[in-house]
């Protein structure tokens, strides 16, 4: 009989473990839905906010159009610029018109005057065509004037109002682009 | 933390084609860029194709016209599609990540071997 009791308030006394051991679990998720709960809350709320607050461009972004233009303010070879704008989130500045050309010459005279400015264009080493970082052909009037000399990969740079090619290593300011946010408005 | 996971990798006959996916997983609500670089053995990490969060595209010369990148934003999920593959594509292929405050991480990275 004794044995019989003992052994009842050991299940009992192991069901009550189990019990607490639930109830913390509870506590803790409870806890840790919370707290989610809050820093969505509070993420939303920056969204919300910067959304409301945001222009089409980031601070010190040029704008035109449907685009975005951030001119360098350090030197960089042709590949750490390209990878300079990703972190950005943004890809070298890809020039798809005549329009656009003048715009960008017209900007950088007014910001910085006449510099050497990487853009997203290169030279296949093996067939020497000129193609853009997305793999499009430049139109005919965007070519680099000048054939570069170089053994080495060649890059496309704008300097005034000219498209110009270099040896991809040397080093040059950079222009990065990327989409405008459109106004939900 | 933002943790990278590849697949995908192997081994593929010259002129074949092989797809590898990378899905970001962690403390990360978006992204500005997402992308793909390679190292071959004693040769120097190098840039293969990139996505921005606009959706904007870039390409290393060896890899237009074969390779194309995608992604899906559901699952911050980027896709690089290699076909045409040769013996030089065999490398080591990382994914990589520059989040919304600019820092760029890195995946393990997988394997590729193009063999004639």
């Known amino acids: 009989k004794l044995l019989q009791v003992s052994t009842i308030a050991m299940q009992q006394q192991e069901k009550l473990i189990q019990q607490e051991r639930a109830l913390l679990n509870f506590t803790e998720w409870k806890r840790s839905c919370a707290l989610q709960m809050k820093y969505c809350q509070a993420f939303m709320q920056n969204s919300l906010s910067s959304a409301h607050n945001s222009s089409p461009c980031p601070n010190n972004w040029i704008q035109n159009r449907e685009s975005c233009y951030y001119v360098s303010e350090i030197w960089s070879i042709w590949h750490t610029s390209q990878e300079n704008c990703l972190k950005e989130g943004s890809t070298l500045l890809q020039i798809e018109s005549k329009e656009e050309m003048d715009f960008i010459t017209g900007s950088l005279r007014k910001i910085k005057g006449s510099y050497d400015y990487w853009v997203g264009l290169s030279q296949d080493g093996h067939s020497g065509r000129w193609l853009w970082q997305d793999g499009s052909s430049p139109s005919p009037g965007l070519l680099p004037a000048e054939r570069s000399q170089s053994a080495n990969q060649v890059c496309g740079y704008v300097k005034s109002n000219s498209l110009l090619s270099s040896n991809c290593s040397t080093w040059k300011y950079f222009i990065c682009e990327k989409y405008a946010l459109r106004s939900s408005v | 933390q933002v943790q990278l996971q590849e697949s995908g990798g192997g081994l593929v006959q010259t002129g074949g084609s092989l797809r590898l996916s990378c899905a970001a997983s962690?403390?990360?609500?978006?992204?500005?860029?997402m992308g793909w670089y390679r190292q071959a053995p004693g040769k120097q990490r190098e840039l293969v194709a990139a996505i921005t969060d606009g959706g904007r595209l870039t390409y290393a010369d060896s890899a237009k016209g074969r390779f194309t990148i995608s992604r899906e934003n559901t699952r911050n999920t980027v896709h690089l599609q290699m076909s045409s593959l040769k013996a030089e594509d065999t490398a080591d292929y990382y994914c990589t990540i520059w989040t919304r405050d600019r820092q760029q991480y890195w995946g393990q990275g997988t394997q590729v071997t193009v063999s004639s």
């Open positions: 962690g403390s990360i609500f978006s992204f500005n860029a």
